[in-house]
């Protein structure tokens, strides 16, 4: 049975040319996690596989950095960056967990600076 | 059991259109992430196009971009690409091939159709 | 475009011996490296990826290493069944390129 609970920074907004720190935790579980999987809606962005570590997606590579952690940072911020994005953990042996971050990217100075895990 | 089927290979004269396909079944197709790939006779594997799973977005090297159109039909689990003013250059077996669901390399790949572009 | 060149172009190994092929991209693909195998009237076959990890179902004679613009495959004990020809592929950044492939026969 899947016990475990995935944490996220939930909405988020940055200003665009920004960066920003996409984070999931995922808790309550005693699974081993074999590879986190970011996702920006169609798009696979990057992989951190436990053992081997991060591959960024060539369609992101200049844009997307691997971490802190299992996070993602994304920078260069577009307004075209804004959508849903996913953080899918494979478990061994729970199977898979799925995390929904909403990111909205604002043309000016009017961005929230409240989020916990954004960059200033 | 996974497997990809091309078809719509054939002869063509330069500046003409093709339409490949490519058929799957025994894994969920709109979960994967597809290629196209080919082969000119005797030479080595080069990258032709790359589409997302939902199909939003694609990928092309410069060899082939404006000319050729990857597309999807995930009701159909069907991949296709559309080959326009083709050269004689673009002479090769094509396969289309699945992205890992682990990495970006191809784990599994069709057998091929072989499109020929000849006056 | 990174230029994926792989060597020797080919090589003449005895069943049994280890085989020893070579790949280096033109600049920095870090672990970004997959290696494909691949039969005469066959699709290619995906033997290794992350330049090291082998994929489900490749036995152990098969392994990878490298990082950054140098890369290796060895093959430890050739069988018969593994005479082909073995391409190295960058997924670093596009276009994707592959290597001129490298033959390996039967001595």
């Known amino acids: 049975m899947m016990t475990g609970t995935i944490e996220t920074t939930g909405n988020i907004s940055a200003e665009k040319g920004g960066s920003i720190i996409l984070q999931c935790h995922l808790s309550s579980t005693t699974a081993q996690v074999t590879q986190v999987n970011w996702e920006q809606q169609d798009q696979l962005l990057a992989i951190c596989n436990a053992d081997l570590g991060w591959h960024i997606s060539p369609s992101f590579k200049d844009r997307v950095a691997p971490g802190p952690g299992l996070g993602l940072t994304l920078q260069s911020l577009t307004v075209n960056d804004t959508g849903e994005y996913f953080c899918i953990y494979h478990t061994y042996p729970d199977g898979t967990y799925t995390g929904r971050i909403f990111l909205e990217v604002l043309e000016s100075s009017v961005a929230e600076h409240g989020a916990r895990f954004q960059i200033p | 059991e996974v497997q990809l089927v091309e078809s719509g290979g054939g002869l063509v004269q330069p500046g003409g259109s093709l339409r490949l396909s490519c058929a799957t079944s025994?894994?969920?197709?709109?979960?994967?992430?597809m290629y196209w790939i080919r082969q000119a006779p005797g030479k080595g594997l080069e990258w032709v196009a790359y589409?997302?799973?939902?199909?939003?977005?694609?990928y092309y090297p410069d060899s082939v971009k404006g000319r050729f159109t990857i597309s999807r039909d995930n009701a159909k689990n069907t991949l296709y690409l559309q080959m326009n003013s083709l050269r004689a250059e673009d002479t090769a077996v094509y396969y289309c091939?699945?992205?890992?669901?682990?990495?970006?390399?191809?784990?599994?790949w069709g057998q091929g159709t072989l499109v020929t572009v000849s006056s | 475009e990174i230029v994926m060149t792989q060597s020797p172009a080919t090589l003449s190994v005895s069943p049994g011996e280890r085989a020893t092929l070579s790949c280096k991209a033109s600049?920095?693909?870090?672990?970004?490296v997959a290696w494909y195998q691949q039969k005469p009237g066959q699709a290619p076959r995906l033997l290794i990826y992350?330049?090291?990890a082998r994929h489900t179902g490749i036995p152990a004679r098969f392994s990878g290493s490298g990082s950054g613009t140098e890369f290796t495959l060895t093959i430890s004990s050739l069988q018969s069944e593994d005479f082909a020809v073995y391409y190295c592929?960058?997924?670093?950044?596009?276009?994707?390129?592959f290597g001129g492939g490298t033959k390996v026969e039967i001595k």
């Open positions: 025994g894994f969920t197709f709109s979960d994967y992430y």
């Open positions: 589409i997302t799973k939902g199909g939003g977005s694609t």
């Open positions: 600049q920095d693909v870090g672990t970004s």
């Open positions: 091939a699945r992205q890992t669901n682990y990495d970006f390399t191809m784990d599994y």
């Open positions: 592929q960058q997924y670093s950044s596009y276009p994707l390129t």
């Open positions: 992350w330049a090291s």
